[in-house]
């Protein structure tokens, strides 16, 4: 009986199991019972990532600079080009189709994790004893100044957005 299913890395055509083309190649002609599957390497600028029976390879992705993209890893005959974002930007998705500017942490918030090419800035509220008075994509919350270590006293309490104000101790006692 002719086969109804084929082994791994084969495909069924005309009641026959033919070898798939390996990654980095494309199909030229199906096998016969007298000759094997005919495959050719992908052209420059193209790739095929899997064992396949495609008559065309896929075009390598173009990392569009106008969208803030740049090449992270050049494509090969077996893999697509990997894009990432320019400095100060990050990908909007895992596929990195486009980039957006890293968010800044507002006053009262500090940077918990600095953004990368694929992830945005992570901000956290400044806890008691810490403050941030700038909008920044890099600055962490800073601890309030310790007046005591400077032989000073707190004249104005700090907030999550402002540092304490220190002043001299009251000598009239």
């Amino acid at each position: 009986e002719p086969p109804t299913a084929c082994r791994e890395k084969q495909y069924l055509i005309n009641s026959q199991c033919c070898s798939l083309c390996q990654p980095g190649q494309k199909l030229v002609s199906d096998c016969t019972e007298f000759t094997e599957t005919e495959c050719l390497p992908c052209d420059s600028g193209e790739f095929s990532a899997q064992w396949n029976r495609e008559i065309r390879c896929h075009q390598h992705r173009h990392c569009e600079p106008n969208q803030g993209l740049r090449v992270k890893k050049e494509g090969t005959a077996e893999s697509d080009t990997v894009c990432t974002c320019e400095e100060g930007w990050h990908c909007t998705s895992e596929a990195c189709e486009s980039c957006v500017l890293h968010r800044s942490c507002s006053p009262g918030f500090g940077v918990k994790q600095i953004a990368t090419g694929v992830s945005d800035t992570i901000c956290e509220p400044c806890p008691v004893g810490f403050f941030s008075n700038v909008s920044s994509a890099f600055e962490k919350c800073h601890p309030w100044t310790s007046c005591e270590t400077k032989d000073l006293v707190v004249q104005q309490a700090g907030t999550n957005k402002t540092d304490v104000v220190c002043g001299p101790q009251d000598r009239l006692r």
Partner: antibody, heavy 117, light 107 residues
Framework: EVQLLESGGGLVQPGGSLRLSCAAS????????MSWVRQAPGKGLEWVSG????????YYADSVKGRFTISRDNSKNTLYLQMNSLRAEDTAVYYC??????????WGQGTLVTVSS | DIQMTQSPSSLSASVGDRVTITCRAS??????LNWYQQKPGKAPKLLIY???SLQSGVPSRFSGSGSGTDFTLTISSLQPEDFATYYC?????????FGQGTKLEIK
């Protein structure tokens, strides 16, 4: 025991026709692709034509395309090669062979075709 | 069509010798190559398939290697019955094609 027995060869004039037969025994004929290979006197081997199993496709060398026709009768366990418009350069011993995994594992003893006036 | 070129066309050797026959394809055929042996007045016999696999019943002194465009058939220790003509045959592209043959003679 696998056996392949060719017949039908002989002397024929240029432009004439001949039909070769190959009687198969000792295996399930319909399950195998079959082919014809020829060898001109004192020369090397030339693949002429092939026919797939289960009524599969037919394939020809460029040198015989349009002149030769391969066929099979699975009920008679027989392979055929109809040769028309014969030329002097078709003179050769014609072998039938069984195909398995892209190789010819069993061959007949051959039949001589001579094209001459 | 793919051209198959064997070398040498003929060679003389003695019983016990190690012999290598080469076959070159005009374009890459992966490992899609067979080797056949033919004795005078007889039909060819399949020795090696898929470049390096030994056909059932063939003595282990025969071996094949190679891929792409360059292939070799090696007989590790010649026996009297090995003197014959050897052909390579590709099945990477339609139609299948043979090399011109290598005649192995007794020295």
């Amino acid at each position: 025991e696998v056996q392949l027995l060719e017949s039908g060869g002989g002397l024929v004039q240029p432009g004439g026709s001949l039909r070769l037969s190959c009687a198969a025994s000792g295996f399930t004929f319909s399950s195998y692709a079959m082919s014809w290979v020829r060898q001109a006197p004192g020369k090397g081997l030339e693949w002429v034509s092939g026919i797939g199993s289960y009524g599969g496709g037919t394939y020809y060398a460029d040198s015989v395309k349009g002149r030769f026709t391969i066929s099979r009768d699975n009920s008679k366990n027989t392979l055929y090669l109809q040769m028309n418009s014969l030329r002097a350069e078709d003179t050769a011993v014609y072998y039938c062979a069984r195909y398995v995994n892209f190789g010819m594992d069993y061959w007949g003893q051959g039949t001589l075709v001579t094209v001459s006036s | 069509d793919i051209q198959m070129t064997q070398s040498p066309s003929s060679l003389s050797a003695s019983v016990g010798d190690r012999v290598t026959i080469t076959c070159r394809a005009s374009q890459s055929i992966s490992s899609y190559l067979n080797w056949y042996q033919q004795k005078p007045g007889k039909a060819p016999k399949l020795l090696i398939y898929a470049a390096s696999s030994l056909q059932s019943g063939v003595p282990s002194r025969f071996s094949g290697s190679g891929s792409g465009t360059d292939f070799t058939l090696t007989i590790s220790s010649l026996q009297p019955e090995d003197f014959a003509t050897y052909y390579c045959q590709q099945y990477g592209r339609n139609p299948p094609t043979f090399g011109q043959g290598t005649k192995l003679e007794i020295k």
